[in-house]
Interface confidence: medium
């Protein structure tokens, strides 16, 4: 018996097509993905083969101006509209909260959404029972499948699950479920989730009785052959781990931002034992043409969204210094801002402990494209901001060890004075130059702001220690040369859209005036 | 309110075909399954097919593959059954009703008035 | 094909009476079984989904239970709008037959 998984995972909000980088669509000959070309060959593929699931494994929240307007009603309508068949929670998903995630998603959705290692506990208990299930199991054509969920067990760091929500380590937590599904004859079974390929492959190895793991959080691109577009595969599709108890179990994720669609066929025999398993994502490029009522469903959709991008979001009653002559060479305001929304972006209150899990953010000067002038009346709109940040980025968290930080701040003034992107803006750092010294060593003093303490100061950093850090990207893919960041984080996160974290925290303050206040200095 | 509305009774001779339509309204129509069912006097009920109006993608119960086709208009929010070489048997009311997809669970919770289709010499 | 058998096929009552109908399925369905209430010359109406949930607006004397091939509708205590023919649903593989339906007639 023969079945077919497509799949998607880390959408964030790329309704429509996009460029081949994934930010906004400039020249439609040439850009990809969208919900409307993503039902043209999921509908192709449906009625061509007979056995098809069509799987999401988390993140479709937060990415673009459609979930800052529409804050998951899209999702539920676009992904209802395409008939996923499930979907499991990924951190993003909790983004505004848990209601943000019931009311828009949850309430609307007409396909399960799954997670087996998230417990509600306290009045949230009976709120949210039913709405999210641990498993569901699936009819296709004449046999059964098992789908069970599995979500990020670090997402209370990563987003705003609130109180009442227990995150479990996923496999103590799946094993169980899987145990009943095999109690229930169930003898087809996949795990869908969204942890980050390390945990999938762990979950393909111990997880007794998984036979298929799809996966996201991680981004991963897994392909068998030559690409077709710029990503380069971690590994081929499907990447297979040898499980514990000496199965052949094929783990998948499918990039992210929808431009590739994850195809695997699974063949399984009558014990439902996976006999082969074979597939790659198919790139949803311009060859593949936009559904035409999926596009005018969009098109309708984004009349909202265009209204939305000049209202007001706050004022500013100080001029908003974005522009290179300051950003690339000292301390700038609009770097200031923008670092102060990622922290409070992160505010997680950890325990008694720590007033928050992270304290630091650092900034690439070059990535501050726009000043915004408070003499039009003060007013700050979604337009102003995304000629501040027109690349369609966001802004996540690491944890790096003091020597990177450290190097990361000598890259930041290598080259001094050539008005090039890489000098940092900071946020809970004070740091001081000495640009007399050689390159490489021109970090005299470098500070950082405690999380482990009741009243926040600033200590030195210590190389050995390690840090968790807000940041672009775009700089924790090695961006701008900073290749010791991408070679040596230890864990990386991908966090909420650049312009929607800074225009969230202008509404939230309503009037803002970032001052230079001697974070970054020259001796 | 969210209602399916069919048109009137039929009568046709063996070997002839009928269409008949299925209006909706009260909801995004493009958004749930149509589905066919019919019922002889005095018999069951018997599903037939359905139709998922955003894109026309259908299925078919395969004792009916080949005489029924399932179409819809969805500028005017309408589902069409048209059933070609008419049989005696076939005399019947035909219901259409909405598929509610809520989270998987699937059931027909709004059924059209019914269309009683009679083949007679 | 997986086929639904009712039982019974018809059934006397009286007001105030529990009654229960059963429906067995050729295969395991996996709780995709509705239950839906016809009367004559109307359209069928929908009662329960699941084998167990109670759609909007039925009265709570309507319950289902069940599991594999096995399921039941059971109504606690009958009224006298609940006189009408039941049908249970699969919704499993299709074909999405129906149980050849149990008529509930005055006794």
């Known amino acids: 018996w023969e079945l077919t998984i497509l799949h998607t995972n880390d959408v964030h909000s790329r309704l429509e097509q996009t460029s081949e980088d994934s930010s906004k669509c400039v020249n439609a000959s040439r850009c990809m993905g969208g919900v409307a070309r993503l039902f043209t060959k999921v509908q192709q593929i449906r009625r061509a083969e007979p056995n098809v699931l069509l799987l999401d494994a988390g993140d479709q929240y937060q990415g673009t101006i459609w979930f800052t307007v529409y804050k998951g009603a899209e999702v539920a309508h676009f992904m209802n509209a395409l008939r996923y068949d499930a979907m499991a929670l990924g951190n993003h998903e909790f983004d505004n909260g848990v209601e943000g995630l019931i009311e828009p998603l949850l309430k609307e959705a007409k396909f399960p959404i799954l997670s087996a290692n998230i417990k509600a506990k306290g009045p949230l208990a009976s709120q949210i029972s039913g709405l999210y299930l641990p498993y569901k199991v699936l009819p296709v054509g004449d046999e059964v499948v098992g789908i069970v969920g599995y979500t990020s067990k670090e997402t209370p760091f990563l987003s705003n699950p609130g109180t009442n929500l227990v995150f479990e380590d996923e496999i103590t937590a799946l094993q169980p479920e899987v145990d009943k599904l095999k109690t229930l004859n169930v003898n087809k079974i996949i795990a869908l989730g969204h942890s980050g390929f390390e945990t999938d492959k762990l979950i393909a190895q111990k997880v007794r009785g998984v036979d298929v793991v799809v996966g996201g959080h991680s981004n991963t691109f897994l392909y068998t052959g030559n690409p077709p577009s710029k990503e380069v595969p971690a590994g081929k599709y499907p990447f297979i781990v040898t499980s514990d108890d000496g199965r052949k179990v094929p783990v998948v994720q499918a990039y992210a931002f929808g431009k590739y669609l994850g195809y695997l066929k699974i063949e399984f025999d009558e014990r439902g034992n996976v006999i082969s398993s074979h597939g790659n994502p198919i790139l949803l490029n311009s060859s593949i043409p936009e559904d035409p009522s999926i596009k005018a469903d969009i098109n309708k959709w984004r009349i909202k969204l265009d209204n939305y991008s000049t209202q007001e979001l706050g004022k500013t009653i100080v001029y908003l210094d974005g522009s290179s002559q300051s950003c690339r060479f000292r301390e700038c305001n609009m770097g200031n801002l923008i670092c102060d929304a990622m922290i409070n972006n992160n505010l997680r209150h950890a325990d008694e402990m720590f007033w928050n899990h992270v304290s630091m953010c650092i900034l690439n000067g070059g990535g501050i494209r726009s000043p915004i002038d408070e003499r039009n009346n003060g007013t700050i709109t979604w337009e102003n901001l995304a000629a501040v940040l027109p690349f369609g980025g966001t802004f996540d968290l690491v944890q790096l060890k003091g020597s990177t930080l450290k190097k990361a701040f000598e890259h930041s003034v290598h080259r001094y004075g050539q008005s090039t992107g890489e000098f940092l803006q900071v946020g809970g750092i004070h740091v001081v130059y000495d640009l007399s010294r050689k390159p490489g060593d021109r970090v005299v003093k470098l500070d950082v702001l405690c999380t482990k303490c009741r009243v926040p100061s600033y200590d030195p950093l210590k190389m050995d220690e390690i840090y968790k850090v807000i940041l672009p990207n775009f700089l924790a893919n090695g961006g701008d040369g900073f290749q010791m960041i991408k070679d040596e984080l230890l864990r990386h996160d991908s966090g909420d859209q650049d312009i929607n974290v800074v225009s969230t925290y202008i509404s939230k303050m309503k009037v803002i005036y970032p001052a230079v206040e001697g974070r970054i200095k020259f001796s | 309110q969210v209602q399916l509305v069919q048109s009137g009774a039929e009568v046709k001779k063996p070997g002839a075909s009928v269409k008949v339509s299925c209006k909706a309204s009260g909801y995004t129509f493009t958004s749930y399954d149509i589905n066919w069912v019919r019922q002889a006097t005095g018999q069951g009920l018997e599903w037939i097919g359905w139709i998922y109006p955003r894109d026309g993608f259908t299925k078919y119960n395969e004792k009916f593959k080949g005489r029924v086709t399932l179409t819809v208009n969805t500028s005017i929010s309408t589902a069409y059954m048209e059933l070609s070489s008419l049989r005696s048997e076939d005399t019947a009311v035909y219901y259409c009703a909405r598929k509610e997809g809520y989270r998987g669970d699937w059931y027909f919770d709004v059924w059209g008035q019914g269309t009683t289709v009679t083949v007679s010499s | 094909d997986i086929q639904m058998t009712q039982s019974p096929s018809s059934l006397s009552a009286s007001v105030g009476d529990r009654v229960t109908i059963t429906c067995r399925a050729s295969?395991?369905?996996?709780?995709?079984l509705a239950w839906y209430q016809q009367k004559p010359g109307k359209a069928p109406k929908l009662l329960l989904y699941?084998?167990?949930t109670l759609a909007s607006g039925v009265p709570s004397r309507f319950s289902g239970s069940g599991s594999g091939t096995d399921y039941t509708l059971t109504i606690s205590s009958l009224q006298p709008e609940d006189f009408a023919t039941y049908y249970c649903?699969?919704?499993?593989?299709?074909?999405?037959?129906f149980g050849g339906g149990t008529e509930l007639e005055i006794k």
């Open positions: 295969g395991n369905v996996h709780n995709y």
């Open positions: 649903q699969h919704f499993w593989s299709t074909p999405w037959t």
């Open positions: 699941n084998a167990k």
